[in-house]
Interface confidence: low
């Protein structure tokens, strides 16, 4: 008996071939001997089966001795043995229809679990193997679960159902709702304008929710809510904002915040949370601000950084086009009695400069100039 696998909602074509390459009488029945369809001359006739409005054949093939049964919009309950009777012969085809669906929603928050459920006909014992967009394979029976979804799990999951040494492939599009980056860091000189961006890693028709940015300044003992906002159909509206600093927020996506001036008292870490309508859980993105200041007081040239710097970052003071006078893995470095000229304060990571501030030291009879 030939076995054919079908997918719920799809169309299947069951073949039936006569030895004579011409149009002759045929009919298809189900296992209960109920006629589904057949022919009378060149006319298609239908029986009283449940498939009535979903069954068809291909008249163009009859002259070649081919009498297919086409079943549209397959249902699990269409799984049955179908019998084609032609030329005193009976061809039996066992059709097994499977369905694969994702739990509740195909739009899931990062960190949530994905469950795929297989609908299968009674008596079948299929195995399922799914491959995620990043190439991870999971195997199972009636249900497959993936916990702790990551951003790379967004995309088309390809699932293969195996039964009777046949297979059928399902494709399920999963969208993992997350920010593009879990964390970002902004390096600024004192006084510069600061831009924070929180791009989302997904696009949806309508996006509604609410969010808040909490800020823990390095110099402060507790965190503070800097801004709260609403999101309606991708439009941003600010609900409440702190007066120090005077933050501004863009009205469109991606979420965008502007701090007019980078000051040492603002250096620190923030956590932007976004709660989306009809979703349990929140999206998070961490943002960090590092601020640099170079100053000269009397005979002391000082360079300082504030904010969450890593211990491997190097802070250096050097006279332009010369070797560094001082280089330390510390948050402040200084030079006593600096020579006149343009001095550079550099914050670097493995030789890559992250932040640079220049200060001009004038001969001792002048006052210093900051460009």
């Amino acid at each position: 008996k030939k076995v054919v696998l079908g997918k719920k909602g799809d169309t299947v074509e069951l073949t039936c071939t006569a030895s004579q390459k011409k149009s002759i009488q045929f009919h298809w029945k189900n296992s209960n001997q109920i006629k589904i369809l057949g022919n009378q001359g060149s006319f298609l006739t239908k029986g009283p089966s449940k498939l009535n409005d979903r069954a068809d054949s291909r008249r163009s093939l009859w002259d070649q001795g081919n009498f297919p049964l086409i079943i549209k919009n397959l249902k699990i309950e269409d799984s049955d043995t179908y019998i084609c009777e032609v030329e005193d012969q009976k061809e039996e085809v066992q059709l097994l229809v499977f369905g694969l669906t994702a739990n509740s929603d195909t739009h899931l928050l990062q960190g949530q679990s994905l469950t795929l459920t297989l609908e299968s006909p009674p008596g079948s014992s299929p195995s399922v193997q799914c491959r995620s967009p990043r190439g991870k394979n999971i195997q199972g029976g009636k249900t497959l679960s993936v916990s702790q979804l990551e951003l790379q799990d967004s995309g088309t999951w390809t699932c293969t159902v195996l039964q009777n040494q046949k297979k059928v492939e399902f494709k399920i599009d999963i969208v993992v709702l997350a920010f593009q980056k879990a964390s970002s860091i902004v390096y600024k000189k004192e006084g510069e304008q600061v831009e924070f961006s929180f791009p989302l890693a997904f696009t949806v028709e309508k996006l509604t929710g609410s969010g808040e940015l909490w800020w823990q300044a390095e110099r402060a003992s507790s965190s503070k809510s800097w801004i709260t906002f609403d999101l309606k159909n991708k439009e941003v509206s600010v609900k409440r904002v702190t007066q120090d600093p005077k933050l501004q927020m863009g009205k469109k996506l991606p979420l965008h915040l502007t701090l007019p001036q980078a000051l040492p008292q603002y250096a620190g870490s923030g956590n932007l949370t976004l709660a989306l309508e009809a979703k349990t859980g929140k999206l998070h993105q961490e943002v960090n601000l590092v601020v640099m200041r170079a100053t000269q007081l009397q005979k002391n040239l000082t360079c300082e950084v504030w904010g969450p710097t890593s211990p491997k970052l190097m802070l250096s003071l050097k006279l332009e086009n010369k070797e560094a006078k001082v280089s330390k893995r510390e948050k402040a470095v200084w030079v006593l009695n600096p020579e006149a000229g343009m001095w550079q304060c550099l914050l670097s990571d493995s030789g890559q400069v992250l932040l640079e501030s220049n200060i001009k030291v004038l001969p001792t009879w002048s006052t210093p100039v900051q460009p």
Epitope: Q129, R131, N137, T156, T158, T160, L162, Q165, K166, K167, V168, E169, K171
Partner: antibody
Framework: QVQLVQSGAEVKKPGASVKVSCKAS????????IAWVRQAPGQGLEWMGI????????SSAQKLQGRVTMTRDTSTSTVYMELSSLRSEDTAVYYC??????????WGQGTLVTVSS | DIQMTQSPSSLSASVGDRVTITCRAS??????LAWYQQKPGKAPKLLIY???TLQSGVPSRFSGSGSGTDFTLTISSLQPEDFATYYC?????????FGQGTKVEIK
């Protein structure tokens, strides 16, 4: 009878891109995947990837990801495979083939792509 | 990725000989294995799919067997037109990798 007809031979310089077409006739275009297989001179067959004309989704071999793009034009029953940043080791005959859940039952005639400076 | 190892890489045989080519998968692929024949300058031709099912129009002297990880292609009586290169390919999960090929030459 199912037929897959591919575009003609191409000569390209290293770093360039090549786009090979594969036109299907005589079958239901959207019911099957179209796989791409290449064969370097004197070498074996290398499976490059597959494109599903029904929804445009694709899957490609890891070593080619980022360089291979498979697209389709359902109005002309044509599938395209574009390979970018060509290098000399991409010199090969490129075949398209109809994928029937893993096995390839109808093949195009092949397209020779030569990468040479 | 599932790797496919074919052996031997080449063999010499005479017309009328019984020829056996083996293919091993690095993990179980159930019966999702196909065999192809390729002649110089031509596209490959599908001989056998689902490990043992003969493709329409392929002579019955070709047969396939095996399941899981070990598979065999047998040509019961080698004919002049059978001198070619034969490839196995797993169709269980992408990438659908081919074996490295077995060249059947005239002794």
């Amino acid at each position: 009878q199912v037929q897959l007809v591919q575009s003609g031979a191409e000569v390209k310089k290293p770093g360039a891109s090549v786009k090979v077409s594969c036109k299907a006739s005589g079958g239901t275009f959207s019911r099957y995947g179209i796989a791409w297989v290449r064969q370097a001179p004197g070498q074996g067959l290398e499976w490059m990837g597959i494109s599903y004309p029904s929804d445009g989704s694709t899957s490609s071999a890891q070593k080619l990801q980022g360089r291979v793009t498979m697209t389709r034009d359902t109005s002309t029953s044509t599938v395209y495979m574009e390979l970018s940043s060509l290098r000399s080791e991409d010199t090969a005959v490129y075949y398209c083939a109809r994928d029937r859940l893993g096995d390839l039952d109808y093949w195009g005639q092949g397209t020779l792509v030569t990468v040479s400076s | 990725d599932i790797q496919m190892t074919q052996s031997p890489s080449s063999l010499s045989a005479s017309v009328g000989d019984r020829v056996t080519i083996t293919c091993r998968a690095s993990q179980s692929i159930s019966s999702w294995l196909a065999w192809y024949q390729q002649k110089p300058g031509k596209a490959p031709k599908l001989l056998i799919y689902a490990a043992s099912t003969l493709q329409s129009g392929v002579p019955s002297r070709f047969s396939g067997s095996g399941s899981g990880t070990d598979f065999t292609l047998t040509i019961s009586s080698l004919q002049p037109e059978d001198f070619a290169t034969y490839y196995c390919q797993q169709g269980y999960s992408t990438p659908y990798i081919f074996g490295q090929g077995t060249k059947v030459e005239i002794k």
